[in-house]
Interface confidence: medium
């Protein structure tokens, strides 16, 4: 079953290559287990950036080597992606799945365009 997901259109990563955005979903029921996946679309290719499953009211748990962290609040997830470079600029899509209890719902946002600008190297000082 389909579900509405919203996310901001544009986000600019900071000078340390970190970008944060919010993903909000309309929960048709009282989901207790939610899975959030961040997908990156660039040059018509879609790749999975990170994913986490969490119990409502608990922290999101990503894999240890994940570049993502996040927190949840109600029907909203605050996602942070770290270690971004200019080449990582692209459309980052939030996919939300209500895993439990049934019925299963899935929604995909329109995507957040994340712009990453590599910092200029500091000039050598004599």
């Amino acid at each position: 079953k389909a579900m509405h997901v919203a996310q901001p259109a544009v986000v600019l990563a900071n000078s340390r290559g970190t970008a944060s955005f919010v993903c909000e979903y309309a929960s048709p029921g009282k989901a207790t287990e939610v899975r959030v996946t961040v997908l990156r679309q660039a040059d018509s290719q879609v790749t999975e950036v990170c994913a986490a499953t969490y119990m409502m009211g608990n922290e999101l748990t990503f894999l240890d080597d994940s570049i993502c962290t996040g927190t949840s609040s109600g029907n909203q997830v605050n996602l942070t992606i770290q270690g971004l470079r200019a080449m990582d600029t692209g459309l980052y899509i939030c996919k939300v799945e209500l895993m439990y209890p049934p019925p299963y719902y899935m929604g995909i946002g329109n995507g957040t365009q994340i712009y990453v600008i590599d910092p200029e190297p500091c000039p050598d000082s004599d």
Epitope: P8, E24, A26, N78
Partner: nanobody, 127 residues
Framework: EVQLVESGGGLVQPGGSLRLSCAAS????????MGWFRQAPGKEREFVAA????????YYADSVKGRFTISRDNAKNTLYLQMNSLRAEDTAVYYC????????????????????WGQGTLVTVSS
Amino acid sequence: EVQLVESGGGLVQPGGSLRLSCAASGRTFSSYDMGWFRQAPGKEREFVAAISWGGVNTYYADSVKGRFTISRDNAKNTLYLQMNSLRAEDTAVYYCARGSAPYSSSRSSAQETYAQWGQGTLVTVSS
């Protein structure tokens, strides 16, 4: 500074319909939760309905559930309140309000969580 301007109020007979609009200036409209409140003559201002920043989740006072529908068009920076099956007790000045923090998940009906208010538009339900 964002400005909120309501319109669409007027005189309507019981059982009739009205659609209120709230036009917001500025480019940050889509980042904020929005709400409608109303104040009847001699009464305190009360919560009517609210909508989340992305337009995904909506919330209503029990007194208007099933009769009023809140919606938003982020491309047009406009908030709406469709009011059907109007009753005499819906007579009030209707205010739109902007949430206090971008991408908030407070989902509150408390007036204190809204940072900006319009001037209001009068809705009179009478035969």
